[in-house]
Amino acid sequence: ITQQDLAPQQRVAPQQKRSSPSEGLCPPGHHISEDGRDCISCKYGQDYSTHWNDLLFCLRCTRCDSGEVELSPCTTTRNTVCQCEEGTFREEDSPEMCRKCRTGCPRGMVKVGDCTPWSDIECVHKESGTKHSGEAPAVEETVTSSPGTPASPCS
């Protein structure tokens, strides 16, 4: 099976408010019906859609993990916003979990940046002032698989 590009995000539920799509799209907080004739509202606190769309369902709301605090709840037009608890942070390259911030810098380095929900403490060498995150350097990874082509189903 082959397909064109995909759009934003979305789910279905019985007995929900309906309206007609505008130029084939439904407003944020809705998804399109299976026959494409109606816009069906998302369920508050359960699912959402953020853009005008023709999604077949609203996307399920994220539940904050233990170790995270909920900054804002899920609405029909916006997903839950979760943030790492104090003393922990989430890195861009491992967004699935909050990691503990380092309590101090390695010997010969001084702290120049505090622990935040999105970064570890920042350390610099006393003499040179060169930046260094609290983490030990990671072993270099070899990428063996190339990224898939955009949206293409079936054999």
């Epitope: 099976i1 082959t2 397909q3 064109q4 590009d5 995909l6 759009a7 934003p8 995000q9 979305q10 084939g24 399109i32 494409g36 769309n53 023709d54 999604l55 077949l56 369902f57 996307l59 399920r60 698989s145 990224p147 898939g148 082509t149 955009p150 949206a151 293409s152 189903p153 079936c154 054999s155």
Partner: nanobody
């Protein structure tokens, strides 16, 4: 080369069960949403179910919800569809599909079956 090979179809009586599998290769399976779609005789492609890349979120069309269960094994690069309480209207060729996000009305409408795609035939009949 992207390859998706479906299996597990067959002839089953109404109320019976089948488990479909889709073996994926040629792409990083764990990065993609996966769908099951079907094509009944003389009809267009119809979306059946979808699962997000991590497998935590599953979605179904109204007519199969509560009877079908989609799942995936990202270590085995395999997608599954457990079909219970089968009805005659479930008779179709079933295909799996990969995509970068959740299914849209326009996307499903513009899907076409590749010449090389065999799918797996599910026939529900007494």
């Amino acid at each position: 080369e992207v390859q998706l090979v479906e299996s597990g179809g067959g002839l089953v009586q109404p109320g019976g069960s089948l488990r479909l599998s889709c073996a994926a290769s040629g792409f990083t399976f764990s990065r993609y949403w996966m769908y099951w779609v079907r094509q009944a005789p003389g009809k267009g492609l119809e979306w059946v179910s979808a699962i997000n890349s991590g497998g935590g979120d599953t979605y179904y069309r109204d007519s199969v919800r509560g009877r079908f269960t989609i799942s995936r094994d990202n270590f085995k690069n395999t997608l599954y569809l457990q079909m219970n309480s089968l009805k005659s209207e479930d008779t179709a060729v079933y295909y799996c599909a990969k995509a970068e996000g959740p299914p849209t009305f326009s996307l499903i409408r513009t899907m076409t079956v590749d010449p090389g795609a065999q799918g797996t035939q599910v026939t529900v009949s007494s």
